[in-house]
């Protein structure tokens, strides 16, 4: 996250960190006690079974008692994900156990299925443990920045016609650099307490107003998300599982 600030610890309890070989790699968010939403491109060249999902974290390198760590039992990328264009860049991660909900681990609500994205100019927040500058500086803890929804046609023009209707864009609202950066991928864009966007890609430089940040528009995939969750029973789960609605 560039141009943002460190959040109050555990104030974004839905945030998930996806790590490989002990290093944070992508973000995600908890929507069900067994399921985390992330970006499909995070797993294009990575074996999901080698990854770990950490919930309840603030400073990833600190051994916080609130942290819950899971391996990935299954990773379900959207069947129409296109790496060449990053269309349909969304993935569901099934945890190998059930998240225990509490003050530091909570679910994030999804938008209603096929809901219109927030209007241009709407203020939203994006969070993550990605770099805080183009120098690939790691953050001290979970970071967040306020951004504004940008009209998709304006954004598509900035992106030389590469976008599709199931994407969403944000900008800083001024000429300052504010937005996401490498390793924020998969994290949520939260507008009105719902995950309307999922971090997908940005331009040559983090937060560059010339190439606005691009997200997967979550509302376009809500039906698919719950179809996948419903189709898969929680392995080893004896209690009832909880989902955000």
């Amino acid at each position: 996250i560039v141009g943002g600030h460190e959040v109050t610890p555990h104030s974004r309890p839905y945030m998930a960190s996806v790590s490989f070989e002990g290093h944070h790699y992508c973000g995600g968010f908890l929507i069900h006690t067994h399921w985390v939403v992330s970006a499909a491109h995070c797993f294009s060249d990575r074996d999901p079974s080698m990854g770990l999902v950490v919930l309840g974290a603030h400073a990833l390198l600190a051994p916080e008692p609130t942290q819950q760590t899971f391996s990935i039992a299954a990773a379900v990328s959207h069947p129409d994900f296109q790496p060449a264009t990053q269309a349909n860049d969304i993935c569901l991660l099934r945890l190998n156990g059930s998240a225990v909900l509490g003050p530091a681990v909570r679910l994030l609500r999804l938008p209603r299925r096929n809901a219109k994205p927030p209007a241009a100019g709407t203020r939203c927040h994006v969070s993550g443990w990605g770099f805080v500058s183009d120098f690939e500086e790691p953050p001290p803890g979970l970071m967040e920045v306020e951004v504004r929804i940008l009209d998709l046609s304006v954004c598509n023009s900035s992106w030389q016609g590469q976008l599709n209707p199931a994407m969403l864009c944000t900008h800083s609202g001024d000429r300052r650099r504010r937005g996401f950066c490498s390793a924020d991928s998969g994290g949520p864009l939260v507008c009105g307490r719902r995950a309307h966007g999922l971090v997908s890609f940005s331009g040559l430089w983090c937060g560059d107003p010339k190439t606005p940040d691009v997200y997967t528009q979550v509302s376009a995939f809500v039906t698919w998300i719950w179809d996948v969750v419903r189709a898969s029973s929680s392995p080893g789960s004896t209690g009832r599982s909880v989902r955000a609605v």
Partner: antibody, heavy 119, light 107 residues
């Protein structure tokens, strides 16, 4: 040792096509953006195109937009520049370059490949 | 697009001289400027990034400074191998743009 090796240059008629390749070694291709930069004979440097580390997004200079396409095959550690509808003003040495950090500079460059557009 | 204007376009200097090349951006680019050295028939080599950071392996006689719109590359004591063309480049706003180059020749 980091290496970038371009190939595919040559003489082509106006309106023709060429595909340049940039074979990378010594670094993780999927961890770094790749750029093409060109230099017309006796002139300065001009940035042409970029492809992100994931290969999922691209950006082009206005002068080549709609005619050139940058792509990458991460399994082969190779980037490509497909050049269509070539013009005399596209004549240049084409370099591929690797990003330092998040594109703060170009830290490694290939040796360049000459593209000549002439009838 | 941001224009990068270098001056002078060429200069003559002797070994041991202190050489200064300037680069002016058409709008604020913060400290996102890199400097490169290029010799005839060769690819450019990175010297300085983010206005003042010396790239690994580059001799300490090279230094960079500036922020906003005005930037400087200084060679404190010119060596025979430094005769080349030098380019600045902004890395702040898409697309990246280069200066037109400054050719450093032997006096």
């Amino acid at each position: 040792e980091v290496q970038l090796v371009e190939s595919g240059g040559g003489l082509v008629q106006p309106g023709g096509s060429l595909r340049l390749s940039c074979a990378a070694s010594g670094f993780t291709f999927s961890g770094s953006g790749i750029h093409w930069v060109r230099q017309a004979p006796g002139k300065g440097l001009e940035w042409v195109a970029w492809i992100s580390p994931t290969g999922g997004n691209t950006y082009y200079a206005d002068s080549v937009k709609g005619r050139f396409t940058i792509s990458a095959d991460t399994s082969k550690n190779t980037a490509y520049l497909q050049m269509n509808s070539l013009r005399a003003e596209d004549t240049a040495v084409y370099y591929c370059a690797k990003s330092l950090f998040h594109n703060v500079a170009f830290d490694y460059w290939g040796q360049g490949t000459l593209v000549t557009v002439s009838s | 697009d941001i224009q990068m204007t270098q001056s002078p376009s060429s200069l003559s200097a002797s070994v041991g001289d202190r050489v200064t090349i300037t680069c002016r951006a058409s709008q604020d680019v913060s400290t996102a400027v890199a400097w490169y050295q290029q010799k005839p028939g060769k690819a450019p080599k990175l010297l300085i990034y983010s206005a003042s950071f010396l790239y690994s392996g580059v001799p300490s006689r090279f230094s960079g400074s500036g922020s906003g719109t005005d930037f400087t590359l200084t060679i404190s004591s010119l060596q025979p191998e430094d005769f080349a063309t030098y380019y600045c480049q902004q890395a702040n706003s898409t697309p990246p743009t280069f200066g037109q180059g400054t050719k450093v020749e032997i006096k």
